[in-house]
C-alpha cells in the first residue's frame, strides 16, 4: 500500500523566524525517516538535537523532533524529512520539506562576500545564478553591475527568488564583471559581491599518466590516459595521433572532473586491443582550447615474449655497516613484463623475517642495519603466466664498528684510585666486525697539576704506545690478548698488568677495525692515602695543649681542601671556616692540609671536618673528627703501692697507675733516689710499671712513685723486702 507523506509540524512551504530563537520541527511518518538540512547546520553542532520516538495511535507511527537552539541567519534553507529505504518508484511521495528563513536585521544575506567577491563561472547563453539569497523574504535586493549599471528583474530574463538569488536565464557578455547585491535594512546598506567569469582558453598542463616508454607484449592491450588541467572556465578538445591511425585501431573515451575547486581536469583514454609490431612507435595526445594548444607524447615498445636477465650490480659479496639508516641491496634486472619480486634471506622470505626489510622495485631496502642482517640474499624473479623464472644470490657482510664492553657497563662517575706500589690488572674487551685489534697507550698526568683534572690535560701532551717492554709510566708485567665469549659473542679481551703502581696517568685502550676506532680512558690515579681521603689527629689535646689535625686527599680526585668547624644552632648545622689553616702541601700523589690550634681551651671542642671537592662530580665531601678538649685534672692514684716481700733471684713488678688530665708523668724513686731504666730494671708503658728481674739484696728498700701533671702531683711508697740469701754468698 502507498505510504502517506511524512508530515511536518510547521505547515506551508516556508516559515520565518528570528535569529536567536529556537527552531522546533517535528516530522511524523509511517516509516523510519531522516532529516536533510542546510549545509551550515552541522549534524554535529551542539545547537542541534534530533530525538526519535514512537507516536500516534498505539505508538505505530515514527516521530522525530529537530531542535535547533539559537538559530542563526546562515542556518536559513530547506529542512526536509524523508523516508529511509523506499523503492525508487515511490520516491516522489516520500519527502516533506519547508524553507525556513532565519531573519537577522544585521545580516540580510545568508552568504556575505563583502571584501572578497565570490567567483561565479558563466557560459554565455546559459543560466547564471547570482546566489545572494536572503534571510527574510521581505528584504528588497538590488542587483548592480560595476561601474554604473543596475540589473532590474523583469520576471522573464532576470528573476528574483529570495531562496536562490537573481536568476539570469541566458547570460550575455553584459553580465561579465563585478555584480553586487545590495539591501538596505534599518538605514544600513549591506553588500555582497560576485565576480562573473567567462570561460577562457588556458591549458595549465597536459600529461600522459603512464610510464615512459610504454612496454607491452604482443597481443596485449594498450591503455594510455591523457590528462589536461585547465582553469575552471576553460573547455578543451583532445585528440590522439598514433602509428596505425589510418586503420583506426584505437578506441577513445573522454570524461571531465570538475570536483577540484581550482581547476578542471579532462581525461582522454586511448585503448588498442591485441597490440602488433605495427602499433609500436610514438603516441601523441593533443589538447586545444581556442587558439591555445599543448601536446605530450610517449613511445610504445612491443616485445615478442617474456624475458628476465639478472646480474650483480657490483660484486657478489657486498659490505655495509651496522647502524646505517638504510642500505639498498639491488640487482641489475632487465625484464618484461614486470616480474614478481621476492627476496630471500638465508633461504627465508626476507620481508616476513623483519619489518625492516622493504622491497622497492628490484631492490631490497634494509632499514637501520644491524649485524643480524649479514647473510645470503637471493632475488627470486618470476613471470608466472609465461613460466619464466630467474634467481641470483649475493652475500652481505655487515661490518660493526668496535665497541668496548667495559665502557658500556661502567657506571663509575669518577675514577678508581690505585694504592701506591700495588699490582693492577686492567682489561678492555672489544667487539666488532672484522675482529678489532687492541692497542694500549699511556698518557702521563702533568705533575705541576693541582687544580685541573688529569684527563683534561692539554692534547699536546702526547700519549705513548705501550708494549710489555715499555719503560713509559709504570712498570708493565705483561700485555695479553685472548678470545672470550660474552653475551654469546666472540669478544677480544686485552689485559694489561701493571707490576708496580707508582705514576698517575691515563691508560687508553684503543680498539680499531676498518669501520672505525673506539677508545676507553682508564684514569689511573695512584693514591698514598687510604680511599683517597684521610683525616689524622695526632692526639686528643687537653686544655692548654696544641690541637694538631691533618687532612690528606688524593690530588687527582680532590681539590679545594679546607678545614671547617661544624656547629649546631637551633637544630641547624652551620659551617664555619677556620682561619688558622696553613698552606696545603702538594706531594706526588696527594695534597695535605694541616690544622694546628695552639693552646686549646674547652671552647675549641667540636666537630672538625675536612672538606674537599670531587674534581669529577663536583660534589663536596666531608670527613669529620669529633674533638673533645679535656679539662685539666690533678693526678690521682688508682691504687697505692703496698709493702711486699719477694724471694731473692725472682722477679717483681710494682704498679703505679694514675689518672689525670693531661696524662700524668710517672717518676720512680728508691730510697729517695730517682730510678733510671737500666739492665734488669724495666719501666713499662708510660713508666706506670716498674719491673725488676732477678731480685738481689740491694733491691730491698723504700720504693716511691710520683705522678705529676700541670695540675699537681700525687705520691705513694712501699717497702720491698728481699728474702733468702744470694747465690753469690752461697757460692762463696
Amino acid at each position: 500500500s502507498k505510504l502517506k507523506d511524512p508530515e511536518l509540524s510547521l505547515k506551508g512551504t516556508q516559515h520565518i523566524m528570528q535569529a536567536g530563537q529556537t527552531l522546533h520541527l517535528q516530522c511524523r511518518g509511517e516509516a523510519a525517516h531522516k532529516w536533510s538540512l542546510p549545509e551550515m547546520v552541522s549534524k554535529e553542532s551542539e545547537r542541534l538535537s534530533i530525538t526519535k520516538s514512537a507516536c500516534g495511535r498505539n505508538g505505530k507511527q515514527f516521530c522525530s523532533t529537530l531542535t535547533l537552539n539559537t538559530a542563526q541567519a546562515n542556518h536559513t534553507g530547506f529542512y526536509s524529512c524523508k523516508y529511509l529505504a523506499v523503492p525508487t518508484s515511490k520516491k516522489k511521495e516520500t519527502e516533506s520539506a519547508i524553507y525556513i528563513f532565519i531573519s537577522d536585521t544585521g545580516r540580510p544575506f545568508v552568504e556575505m562576500y563583502s571584501e572578497i567577491p565570490e567567483i561565479i563561472h558563466m557560459t554565455e547563453g546559459r543560466e547564471l545564478v547570482i546566489p545572494c539569497r536572503v534571510t527574510s523574504p521581505n528584504i528588497t535586493v538590488t542587483l548592480k553591475k560595476f561601474p554604473l549599471d543596475t540589473l532590474i528583474p523583469d520576471g522573464k530574463r532576470i528573476i528574483w527568488d529570495s531562496r536562490k538569488g537573481f536568476i539570469i536565464s541566458n547570460a550575455t557578455y553584459k553580465e561579465i564583471g563585478l555584480l553586487t547585491c545590495e539591501a538596505t535594512v534599518n538605514g544600513h546598506l549591506y553588500k555582497t559581491n560576485y565576480l562573473t567569469h567567462r570561460q577562457t582558453n588556458t591549458i595549465i598542463d597536459v600529461q600522459i599518466s603512464t610510464p615512459r616508454p610504454v612496454k607491452l607484449l604482443r597481443g596485449h592491450t594498450l591503455v594510455l590516459n591523457c590528462t589536461a588541467t585547465t582553469p575552471l572556465n576553460t573547455r578543451v578538445q583532445m585528440t590522439w595521433s598514433y602509428p596505425d591511425e589510418k586503420n583506426k585501431r584505437a578506441s577513445v573515451r573522454r570524461r571531465i572532473d570538475q570536483s577540484n575547486s581550482h581547476a578542471n581536469i579532462f581525461y582522454s583514454v586511448l585503448t588498442i586491443d591485441k597490440m602488433q609490431n605495427k602499433d609500436k612507435g610514438l603516441y601523441t595526445c593533443r589538447v586545444r582550447s581556442g587558439p591555445s594548444f599543448k601536446s605530450v607524447n610517449t613511445s610504445v615498445h612491443i616485445y615478442d615474449k617474456a624475458f628476465i636477465t639478472v646480474k650483480h650490480r657490483k660484486q657478489q659479496v657486498l659490505e655495509t655497516v651496522a647502524g646505517k639508516r638504510s642500505y639498498r641491496l639491488s640487482m641489475k634486472v632487465k625484464a618484461f613484463p614486470s616480474p614478481e619480486v621476492v627476496w630471500l634471506k638465508d633461504g627465508l622470505p626476507a620481508t616476513e623475517k623483519s619489518a625492516r626489510y622493504l622491497t622497492r622495485g628490484y631492490s631490497l631496502i634494509i632499514k637501520d642495519v644491524t649485524e643480524e642482517d649479514a647473510g645470503n640474499y637471493t632475488i627470486l624473479l618470476s613471470i608466472k603466466q609465461s613460466n619464466v623464472f630467474k634467481n641470483l644470490t649475493a652475500t652481505l657482510i655487515v661490518n660493526v664498528k668496535p665497541q668496548i664492553y667495559e665502557k658500556a657497563v661502567s657506571s663509575f662517575p669518577d675514577p678508581a684510585l690505585y694504592p701506591l706500589g700495588s699490582r693492577q690488572i686492567l682489561t678492555c674487551t672489544a667487539y666488532g666486525i672484522p675482529q678489532p685489534t687492541i692497542k694500549w697507550f699511556w698518557h702521563p698526568c702533568n705533575h705541576n697539576h693541582s687544580e685541573a683534572r688529569c684527563d683534561f690535560c692539554s692534547n699536546n701532551e702526547e700519549s705513548f704506545i705501550l708494549d710489555a717492554d715499555s719503560n713509559m709510566g709504570n712498570r708493565i708485567e705483561s700485555i695479553t690478548q685472548r678470545m672470550a665469549i660474552i653475551e654469546g659473542k666472540n669478544k677480544m679481551a686485552s689485559t694489561l698488568v701493571v707490576a708496580d703502581s707508582r705514576i698517575s696517568g691515563i691508560y687508553i685502550c684503543i680498539a680499531s677495525n676498518k669501520v672505525g676506532t673506539v677508545g676507553r680512558n682508564i684514569s689511573f690515579y695512584i693514591t698514598d692515602v687510604p680511599n683517597g681521603f684521610h683525616v689524622n689527629l695526632e692526639k686528643m689535646p687537653t686544655e692548654g695543649e696544641d690541637l694538631k689535625l691533618s687532612c690528606t686527599v688524593n690530588k687527582f680526585l680532590y681539590r679545594d681542601v679546607t678545614w671547617i668547624l661544624l656547629r649546631t644552632v637551633n637544630n641547624r648545622t652551620m659551617h664555619y671556616s677556620i682561619s688558622k689553616q696553613k698552606m696545603a702541601i702538594t706531594k706526588e700523589h696527594s695534597i695535605t692540609l694541616n690544622l694546628t690550634i695552639m693552646n686549646v681551651s674547652l671552647q675549641d671542642s667540636g666537630t672538625y671536618a675536612c672538606r674537599a671537592r670531587n674534581v669529577y662530580t663536583g660534589e663536596e665531601i666531608l670527613q669529620k673528627k669529633e674533638i673533645t678538649i679535656r679539662d685539666q685534672e690533678a693526678p690521682y692514684l688508682l691504687r697505692n703501692l703496698s709493702d711486699h716481700t719477694v724471694a731473692i733471684s725472682s722477679s717483681t713488678t710494682l704498679d703505679c697507675h694514675a689518672n689525670g688530665v693531661p696524662e700524668p708523668q710517672i717518676t720512680w724513686f728508691k730510697n729517695n733516689h730517682k730510678i733510671q731504666q737500666e739492665p734488669g730494671i724495666i719501666l713499662g708503658p708510660g713508666s706506670s710499671t716498674l719491673f725488676i728481674e732477678r731480685v738481689t739484696e740491694e733491691d730491698e728498700g723504700v720504693y716511691h712513685c710520683k705522678a705529676t701533671n700541670q695540675k699537681g702531683s700525687v705520691e705513694s711508697s712501699a717497702y720491698l723486702t728481699v728474702q733468702g740469701t744470694s747465690d753469690k754468698s752461697n757460692l762463696e
Epitope: 567567483i119 561601474p147 554604473l148 564583471g177 563585478l178 565576480l195 581550482h262
Partner: antibody, heavy 116, light 107 residues
Framework: QVKLQQSGAELVKPGASVKLSCTAS????????IHWVKQSPEQGLEWIGR????????KYDPKFQGKATITADTSSNTAYMQLRSLTSEDTAVYYC?????????WGHGTTVTVSS | DIELTQSPKFMSTSVGDRVSVTCKAS??????VAWYQQKPGQSPKALIY???YRYSGVPDRFTGSGSGTDFTLTISNVQSEDLAEYFC?????????FGGGTKLEIK
C-alpha cells in the same frame, strides 16, 4: 569610463600634515571600496588602508594607524587621505586604487616630498 | 601580518623565453592573490586576480597559478614590452600586503 583622479604633488615641511584627494569618475564611490597604497624605493609597495564610503567603515595597516586618516565625501565622489607629523620616511608616491578584483583601476599617484 | 616573499628579486631573460616568478606567503591565503606589473614611471597595472584569473585585455602569455602559500606568475613567451617590475599582493586578510617585487630585464 572609470577613472581615479589624484591631487597634485606636495612639498611639505617635517612635522606638518597633508591631505591628498582621489576623485572618482565613471562610477559611484558608494558602490565600492577605495584603497590607498604607498610606494617608496626603500619599502616598495605598502598597503595603507581602505574605506567603505557609504558607512565610512575604515581598515588600516596598524603601521599607518595614527599616521593616516582616510575619509570620503560621497556627494563629491571623492576619497581623501590625511597624513600627519610628516618625516622624511613619508616621502613617497601615494596611490588610490580600487580593490584588486575590481579590474585595473589605480590613480596616477601623488608624490609627497618631506623636506625642510 | 602575512608576509609575502617574492623571488627572484632580479631576472634577466631574452625575448621568447619562459620565466616564472614565485611568491610565498607566511600563512595560508587560499587563492586571494593578485599580480601587478609596473613599468618605469607608471602606476601598477593588475594582471591576475584570485591567483589564476587574467584580467580582460591581459595577454594569455601571462599565467597565474597556486593556492594556499605558494604562487607563481609565468610569462611563457617574453616580449620586449614585458620589461617591468612585478608584484604579488594578498587580499585574504587585513592588512593587505605586497611582495618585495621582481625586476624583469630583457637581454
Amino acid at each position: 569610463q572609470v577613472k581615479l583622479q589624484q591631487s597634485g604633488a606636495e612639498l611639505v615641511k617635517p612635522g606638518a600634515s597633508v591631505k591628498l584627494s582621489c576623485t572618482a569618475s565613471g562610477f559611484n564611490i558608494k558602490d565600492t571600496y577605495i584603497h590607498w597604497v604607498k610606494q617608496s624605493p626603500e619599502q616598495g609597495l605598502e598597503w595603507i588602508g581602505r574605506i567603505d564610503p557609504p558607512n565610512d567603515n575604515t581598515k588600516y595597516d596598524p603601521k599607518f594607524q595614527g599616521k593616516a586618516t582616510i575619509t570620503a565625501d560621497t556627494s563629491s565622489n571623492t576619497a581623501y587621505m590625511q597624513l600627519r607629523s610628516l618625516t622624511s620616511e613619508d616621502t613617497a608616491v601615494y596611490y588610490c586604487a580600487l580593490p584588486p578584483f575590481y579590474f585595473d583601476y589605480w590613480g596616477h599617484g601623488t608624490t609627497v616630498t618631506v623636506s625642510s | 601580518d602575512i608576509e609575502l616573499t617574492q623571488s627572484p628579486k632580479f631576472m634577466s631573460t631574452s625575448v621568447g623565453d619562459r620565466v616564472s616568478v614565485t611568491c610565498k606567503a607566511s600563512q595560508n591565503v587560499d587563492t586571494n592573490v593578485a599580480w601587478y606589473q609596473q613599468k618605469p614611471g607608471q602606476s601598477p597595472k593588475a594582471l591576475i586576480y584570485s591567483a589564476s584569473y587574467r584580467y580582460s585585455g591581459v595577454p594569455d602569455r601571462f599565467t597565474g597559478s597556486g593556492s594556499g602559500t605558494d604562487f607563481t606568475l609565468t610569462i611563457s613567451n617574453v616580449q620586449s614590452e614585458d620589461l617591468a617590475e612585478y608584484f604579488c599582493q594578498q587580499y585574504n586578510s587585513f592588512p593587505y600586503t605586497f611582495g618585495g617585487g621582481t625586476k624583469l630585464e630583457i637581454k
